[in-house]
């Protein structure tokens, strides 16, 4: 028989201490960084892989331009605040009682200010578009093929439903997958689209964070698909607010 | 192969203590939960609680919290129930179980009589 | 506590029958549910976990199946050896919590 410890462990979150200390002998796996309890049936809030990143040791086929109030993660990483869900708190502040507001993927939308900054809601990002450019090939992708293979991606790899893949857009060498999902969308059990994408880019930058799992390897009509760059851009259901000094910059 | 031998029967006066042991063999002790079940005569199972012995973790069913407590001693792989403040009604058969995801091994069973 | 209700607490049924029994939670318990077999002056034995897994060496004849509140062990053609007390318990949360059982007799 092998031992309990061999099967304890989080196939979605390798950044988790799993032991099958749970009820009636379940393997029960909590995250670094949270001590909180993860569903590793699911994928993990992208809060919680934030905090546990940053508790490890230190090592048409037209394009679509992003609205004038998309955002990106300019300010990398940070030790977020989760609330008991796992979910960013509207509210970060770091050690230096300097704060801001944030949407639910932990992308700052406000400036920053000091511990009297009030951010009421947490805002939902209904709307990602993740910009790739691959490497070079000898021809362009079959739009189509490429297409399909992204959606099988996010339905199989993440566990996102395909209604929330609104589109894949190409145009050599740049790729646009869209992900919508409205507040009203998303049932009890979705994988939400913040941590699909956060999952996609880390996959894509070869730091997997599932268990065990190979990295992505992407492949359309058995052709490797090799990213180069990535920029990912967040719309959120309310526009952000930031002052005209920063959007004149 | 998994084995988990009790100790053998006990009769106790009310108000007494009792210590059930269970000793584990074919497997890693500090692997796997064992949890403590008991049974009245001719009635149902009774989940009492649960030790792992890999960290010395435990849970109890708060109807015996105060009167029940788990141990494990890992240098001879074996787990131990002791029950104290003895009443006529905790007459049963007390087994002790190997738990992974649900999936159970079972002592033999101790018989623990309660009678003045 | 989650408690489980187990239906019916006995039933008659002959070699050959398919026997159903089911268990029912008082909240959602995510699949963690498993069944037992107990006999006369003998130890529990385990016979499906995570609702519907079968454990090594039990015969195919046993099978689990539901989910949520509403679970289900079936026999399909009892045997002789059968008979005896089955149980159900969730482990989804703690306490552990059984079902009353359900004894198997024969007509």
């Known amino acids: 028989h092998t031992a309990a410890q061999d099967n304890c462990t989080c196939p979605t979150n390798k950044m988790t201490v799993c032991s099958p200390d749970g009820p009636g002998g379940r393997c029960q796996c909590r995250a670094l960084g949270s001590g909180m309890a993860v569903d590793c049936s699911t994928l993990t809030s992208k809060c919680l892989l934030l905090k546990a990143r940053m508790s490890a040791p230190k090592n048409a086929r037209t394009l679509v331009r992003p609205s004038e109030h998309a955002l990106v993660d300019n300010d990398g990483l940070y030790d977020p605040d989760c609330d008991p869900e796992g979910r960013f708190k509207a509210r970060q502040c770091n050690q230096t009682s300097v704060c801001w507001c944030v949407n639910s993927v932990g992308v700052r939308r406000t400036d920053k200010g000091d511990l009297s900054l009030r951010c009421d809601e947490l805002v939902r990002t209904h709307h990602i578009l993740i910009d790739l450019r691959h490497r070079p090939t000898a021809g362009a992708f079959n739009h189509s093929d490429l297409d399909a293979e992204l959606r099988r991606l996010f339905r199989e790899r993440y566990r996102l439903h395909p209604k929330f893949v609104a589109a894949v857009h190409y145009e050599q060498p740049t790729i646009q997958i869209e992900l919508r999902q409205n507040t009203s969308q998303k049932a009890a059990g979705d994988v939400d689209i913040g941590d699909a994408a956060y999952y996609f880019e880390r996959d894509i930058k070869g730091e997997s964070l599932f268990q065990g799992r190979g990295g992505l390897d992407l492949r359309v009509r058995g052709e490797p698909l090799q990213v180069e760059r990535t920029l990912i851009y967040y719309l959120d259901e309310i526009p952000p607010k930031f002052s005209m000094k920063r959007l004149t910059a | 192969q998994v084995q988990l031998v009790q100790s053998g029967a006990e009769v106790k006066k009310p108000g007494s203590s009792v210590k059930v042991s269970c000793k584990a063999s074919?497997?890693?002790?500090?692997?796997?939960?064992i949890n403590w079940v008991r049974q009245a005569p001719g009635q149902g199972l009774e989940w009492m609680g649960q030790i792992y012995p890999g960290s010395d973790s435990f849970h109890y069913n708060q109807k015996f919290q105060g009167r029940a407590t788990l141990t494990a001693d890992k240098s001879t792989n074996t787990a131990y129930m002791e029950l104290s403040s003895l009443r006529s009604e905790d007459t049963a058969v007390y087994y002790c179980?190997?738990?992974?995801?649900?999936?159970?091994?079972w002592g033999q069973g101790t018989l623990v009589t309660v009678s003045s | 506590d989650i408690q489980m209700t187990q239906s019916p607490s006995s039933l008659s049924a002959s070699v050959g029958d398919r026997v159903t029994i089911t268990c029912k939670a008082s909240q959602g318990i995510n699949n963690y549910l498993s069944w037992y077999q107990q006999k006369p002056g003998k130890a529990p034995k385990s016979l499906i976990y995570r609702a519907n897994r079968l454990v090594d060496g039990v015969p195919s004849r046993f099978s689990g199946s539901g989910s949520g509140t509403d679970f289900t062990l079936t026999i399909s053609s009892l045997q002789p050896e059968d008979f005896a007390t089955y149980y159900c318990?969730?482990?989804?949360?703690?306490?552990?919590?059984f079902g009353g059982g359900t004894k198997v007799e024969i007509k």
């Open positions: 074919g497997y890693r002790f500090t692997d796997y939960v």
């Open positions: 179980a190997r738990f992974f995801e649900g999936l159970a091994y």
């Open positions: 318990l969730q482990y989804d949360e703690f306490p552990l919590t």
